[in-house]
Amino acid sequence: ITRQSLDPQRRAAPQQKRSSPTEGLCPPGHHISEDSRECISCKYGQDYSTHWNDFLFCLRCTKCDSGEVEVNSCTTTRNTVCQCEEGTFREEDSPEICRKCRTGCPRGMVKVKDCTPWSDIECVHKES
């Protein structure tokens, strides 16, 4: 049985601190107790779990680095979402740092796309 295929109605209500595992798994926002008898709620703002699981520990919430802004805060079921500050972007091949966007295009080229948190400006050759 995949975690997603379990009946959503059997998930613990948000206010519940503890519930019983379903087929050995606990719902998102929880982890399993070490005797497998209970599902224990993750701590809001500290840790989370996104799927049905048998984790002994919830996953630690990410803390945004300097140079990043928090777009979505961590909940018990979703990790923090961090984004590069304005004027910087995160490259696919080096996702751990935010790099400064170029301020302009080289001579003979024109900007066709602005800087975003995910990409540098895009330049194309001017039509002659």
């Epitope: 050995g24 070490e34 005797d35 497998s36 984790f55 002994l56 520990f57």
Partner: antibody, heavy 117, light 108 residues
């Protein structure tokens, strides 16, 4: 009565491998998280690894990550620790323990792993 | 990682005296995940206290645990000859699970 009996320790050369086993009895093995804890000669206790009751989730100390693998066979009531790329600093008595986060409420007698050339 | 620092390193006391052992955490630890163990030479550790203050099965009531946050204490109200050993605190609040370096309680 809860009993944990480790085996598989011994002398191994640096870079070598060893598999420790822990035979459990006296409790519903498949329900409980289990751990390995080690103690170097004359030193304190160091947690090595833990595994959930079903075996679906595993955790490791940074010092052994990528080299050691914890596993369990619930049909045999047995816990394992596969140790690869052994180093001098891995030399210790290895204890199998019932539990993980809240406490280690039962311990085996330990098995000695000696890493030496 | 949460570092647990135990003090003192060695405690020299006489039978009948009170022993107070400290365990200080580098970050806040949930009381539910703080335990104390006793270990005698050549033996496996034995669980004394779990959940910071609950005595494990068969542990005499002269052993008690207290504390919260970053400061925890194990108290042995009246030391018996069999209590001279090394004591360790352990946290499971967040991975990796860690132990303190131990406090040796020796006969004065």
């Amino acid at each position: 009565e809860v009993q944990l009996l480790e085996s598989g320790g011994g002398l191994v050369q640096p870079g070598g491998s060893l598999r420790l086993s822990c035979a459990a009895s006296g409790f519903t093995f498949s329900s409980y998280a289990m751990s390995w804890v080690r103690q170097a000669p004359g030193k304190g206790l160091e947690w090595v690894s833990a595994i959930s009751g079903s075996g679906g989730s595993t955790y490791y100390a940074d010092s052994v990550k990528g080299r050691f693998t914890i596993s369990r066979d619930n049909s045999k009531n047995t816990l394992y620790l596969q140790m690869n790329s052994l180093r001098a600093e891995d030399m210790a008595v290895y204890y199998c323990a019932k539990g993980a986060r809240v406490s280690f409420d039962y311990w085996g007698q330990g098995t000695l792993v000696t890493v030496s050339s | 990682e949460i570092v647990l620092t135990q003090s003192p390193g060695t405690l020299s006391l006489s039978p009948g005296e009170r022993a107070t052992l400290s365990c200080r955490a580098s970050q806040s630890v949930s009381s539910s995940y703080l335990a104390w163990y006793q270990q005698k030479p050549g033996q496996a550790p034995r669980l004394l206290i779990y959940g910071a203050s609950s005595r494990a099965t068969g542990i005499p009531d002269r052993f008690s645990g207290s504390g919260s946050g970053t400061d925890f204490t194990l108290t042995i109200s009246r030391l018996e000859p069999e209590d001279f050993a090394v004591y360790y605190c352990q946290q499971g609040s967040q991975p990796p699970i860690t132990f303190g370096q131990g406090t040796k309680v020796e006969i004065k």
